[in-house]
């Protein structure tokens, strides 16, 4: 059958029918339904929601909907022995204690099973000592403390403000600095936008609000006890001492009312510069310890959380492809939340639900996609991307042979200013073309395309007239698909104006105040931004699953490879004498990029000209496109990070949320001037250039004519 026979309706009509079926009112209704009670991973409530979604996806018309369960390591506070932090006097008496819970928002006072704020996977402990304020606890913050200010964090409890980087990186940095405990807090400078009221009167964080979150350093491993393999019924589990990525020191999060009480007494060194000052009325002294009058007082942490192997449930829905059922386009987002999940994840889950409903409607009318679409509701994302990673580990052989693309669907909104897209360069043209066909929901852009408002509000720093598209990092469920398996991936959501709102994420992130009302009252009352995100995510899935030739442009990879090579060479050029001394050359990498550019260009010409009615040739060309992302995978992985295998992109070693290009070379060059053995260090740079050059060349050759 030709594609059009199989799919029963002309392609253009299909896409329009699919998009027209998406309704803002339905997304609103689904969001409400998903946010009335907490859905913490590993709880009965989240299992019940999984079964509800399974049932509804079946009703919507999917061919099959199954639950996939795994038994993974999760972490919970002790219900009878709460976590808190004290200031103790010289006699050991607790003269101040941090709060044990967030004041519940109006209308939710009688909801049970609201997990109190905690840092998931913190070990138990009751360390006491002097406090050191470490700003955001970034690598550069510890460099400033240790190298410039000569402040030793060894044996100290450090207090760090949330923001800028993933909290797990903060904890890792504190551990490496010798700290014996970490207090994380939300500073109003980062989580309170000027001119906006606190929840429930606005979308700002109140003083009693606290950000929950895991503090793992998994580096893509999934379940800490079964790295590389699914946590199934017959799994061999590591002992807790050998578990991947667990922190070794107690960690606990607090709000800014409690932080004020700890920071106002700080003595020792003054902050090194204004970038270390937040918005509290405190001096932001670095310490160590409290100022004169309070110098005999110490800080004590009381952490009693436990790690427990717990069952989790993914929901996997299948819509079988009519022509290429063995080619998979995946739309996935998580279902588990810290509390109500008003934004994270249910604003995304509601969009996925509506996308499934629309596809189901088309299917009931006799349509099928060309390729198979898989829909996933992941569990335990908040505990380290566990559900998605375990499923991908279980199905890795199928995915690496059949996976066309993965589209992520966590929070649909983190603001209501403009679109934000992170994706593989293969999808740039798909995103551009799709957004040109969609209407902008933005005020002042009535009758204009989404592409136009997006480009105006978020212009590309390199190419005029084009929007910014960012690199994929991590911190979400695309990680295993992209960074480990090399499946082309992308994500889209509505975001804030980063230029005027410099707070990190959105203020109520991972707090009890992330409710349905937060979205309905303050972010998107008409659900028009949610609808737009549904159109972008759904439209991408539709095109990827239905276009005869895969909508990937390999020439865009060539452009970014040249840019990334130029960037990494520029970093290396800061050490020109060492490059000369150790004969460090990037010529092999630039040569490989040049070859890639030429071969990609020739491939694109052939793609225009080949006989698309010949199914064998069509499949051959599509396979070359599908496997291009796979060709950037190094089976040996990155140094000390075996599950990060993509040579072009990896999560930054200093911030899991951020993507780094040519990460192997980047990490080898990082802080190279401080290495004790420069010859060895520069040898590793040369080795990483070799790996990168080889990989780019090998990827290029997959696009060459096959014979």
């Amino acid at each position: 059958k030709s594609s059009n026979e199989a799919t029963n309706i002309t392609p253009k009509h299909n896409m329009k029918a699919f998009l027209d079926e998406l309704k803002a009112e339905n997304i609103k209704k689904f969001l409400y339904n998903f946010t009335q009670i907490p859905h913490l991973a590993g709880t009965e409530q989240n299992f019940q929601l999984a079964k509800q979604i399974q049932s509804q996806w079946k009703e919507f018309g999917l061919d099959s909907v199954e639950l996939a369960h795994y038994d993974v390591l999760l972490s919970y506070p002790n219900k009878t022995h709460p976590n808190y932090i004290s200031i103790i006097n010289e006699d050991g008496n607790e003269i101040f204690n941090t709060s044990l819970f967030e004041p519940p928002p109006p209308g939710y006072e009688n909801v049970s099973d609201i997990v109190p704020p905690f840092s998931a996977f913190s070990p138990q402990g009751m360390p006491e000592g002097d406090l050191v304020y470490v700003n955001y606890a970034r690598t550069e913050d510890f460099f400033k403390l240790e190298r410039d200010m000569k402040i030793n964090c060894s044996g100290k409890i450090v207090i760090a403000r949330y923001g800028k980087v993933f909290r797990g990186n903060k904890v890792k940095n504190a551990q490496l600095a010798g700290a014996k405990g970490v207090i994380l807090y939300s500073d109003p400078a980062d989580y309170f936008a000027p001119g906006v009221k606190s929840y429930p009167d606005g979308w700002n964080l109140p003083g009693g609000g606290v950000q929950r979150g895991n503090i793992l350093n998994l580096n893509g491993a999934g379940d800490p006890l079964t790295p590389g393999y699914p946590a199934n019924e017959y799994a061999y589990r590591r002992g807790i001492a050998e578990a991947v990525g667990l922190p070794s020191i107690p960690v606990h999060p607090i709000g800014y009312y409690d932080a004020q009480k700890l920071l106002e007494k700080m003595g020792g060194s003054a902050p090194p510069d204004s970038s270390w000052r937040g918005s509290l009325k405190v001096p932001y002294n670095v310490g160590p310890g409290f100022t004169g009058n309070f110098s005999t007082q110490k800080v004590k942490m009381h952490i009693h959380s436990t790690n427990e192997v717990t069952r989790i449930y993914n929901v996997i829905g299948t819509l079988r492809g009519a022509v290429e059922p063995d080619r998979y386009v995946i739309l996935g987002g998580h279902r588990d939340s810290w509390v109500f999940g008003g934004i994270d994840p249910q604003s995304g889950a509601a969009v996925v639900h509506e996308i499934v409903r629309s596809f189901g409607t088309l299917k009931k009318e006799g349509w099928r996609p060309r390729r198979t679409i898989l829909f996933a509701s992941w569990d335990a994302e908040e505990f380290g991307l566990l559900g998605s990673t375990e499923w991908a580990e279980e199905n890795s052989r199928l995915l690496q042979e059949r996976g066309v693309a993965y589209i992520n669907a966590d929070s649909s909104i983190e603001g209501n200013y403009t679109l934000r897209v992170d994706c593989t360069p293969l999808m740039y043209s798909l995103v551009h073309n799709l957004t040109k066909e969609l209407k902008s929901p933005d005020e002042g852009f009535e009758g204009k395309s989404l592409y136009e408002s997006w480009t105006k509000k978020s212009p590309s720093p390199e190419f005029s007239g084009m929007p910014r598209i960012s690199k994929l990092g991590s911190g979400n469920d695309f990680e295993v698909f992209f960074q480990r398996l090399g499946i082309a991936s992308g994500r889209a959501r509505y975001t804030k104006n980063w230029e005027t709102n410099k707070f990190s994420g959105y203020p109520l992130y991972h707090s009890v105040y992330e409710t349905y009302e937060l979205v309905e009252k303050f972010y998107d009352p008409m659900f028009k931004y949610h609808l737009t995100v549904a159109q972008v995510r759904g439209g991408m899935v539709f095109e990827l699953a239905n276009s005869i030739v895969l909508p990937f442009d390999c020439r865009d990879y060539a452009v970014v490879l040249r840019k990334y090579a130029d960037k990494i060479y520029s970093i290396s050029m800061k050490h020109p004498q060492e490059m000369k001394t150790y004969s460090v050359s990037f010529d092999s990498l630039f040569s490989a990029v040049k070859n890639f550019t030429e071969i990609a260009s020739k491939f694109s010409e052939r793609l225009q000209d080949f006989d698309k009615s010949n199914p064998i040739v069509l499949r051959m060309m599509n396979d070359q496109l599908m496997f291009l992302e796979r060709a950037f995978i190094d089976p040996l992985g990155l140094p000390d990070r075996p599950f990060y295998r993509h040579v072009i992109y990896a999560p930054s070693s200093h911030n899991k949320y951020a993507g780094e290009s040519f990460p192997g070379i980047y990490d080898a060059l990082f802080d190279i001037e401080s290495k004790v053995d420069p010859s060895k260090a520069w040898g590793e740079v040369k080795r990483q250039i070799y790996v990168a050059a080889f990989t780019v060349q090998a990827a290029a050759e997959t696009l060459s004519e096959v014979a």
Partner: nanobody, 118 residues
């Protein structure tokens, strides 16, 4: 032929200014980062500054921050280094370095000597 030619060097007193130029030919200048590197007499090579593609982003070695400014005129295929408040320790041969749009090897100019002396 891909070529970089520096000019503008000379002898100058401490505290005064100089502006170095680097004219590029034979490649698409606007597309890529450009660098200034210097070598003081009897010393090794030292990176001074980098300016990225469109000229909006630049970086400097700590010792010249606030005194040197790198810029580029993509229309004229020229790179500049404005050096203010010069010090004796800025005495060096200054090289511009770049990579053409299709060149595999980096291109170095022949250098221009700057001597800061009273």
């Amino acid at each position: 032929e891909v070529q970089l030619v520096e000019s503008g060097g000379g002898v100058v007193q401490p505290g005064r200014s100089l502006r170095l130029s680097c004219a590029a030919s034979g490649f698409t200048f606007s597309s890529y980062a450009m660098h200034w590197v210097r070598q003081a007499p009897g010393k090794g090579l030292e990176w001074v500054a980098t300016i990225y593609q469109d000229g909006s982003e630049s970086e400097y070695v700590d010792s010249v921050k606030g005194r040197f400014t790198v810029s580029r005129d993509n229309a004229k295929n020229t790179l500049y280094l404005q050096m203010d408040s010069l010090r004796a320790e800025d005495t060096a041969t200054y090289y511009c370095v770049g990579r053409g749009s299709t060149s595999i090897t980096p291109v170095w100019g022949l250098g221009t000597l700057v001597t800061v002396s009273s």
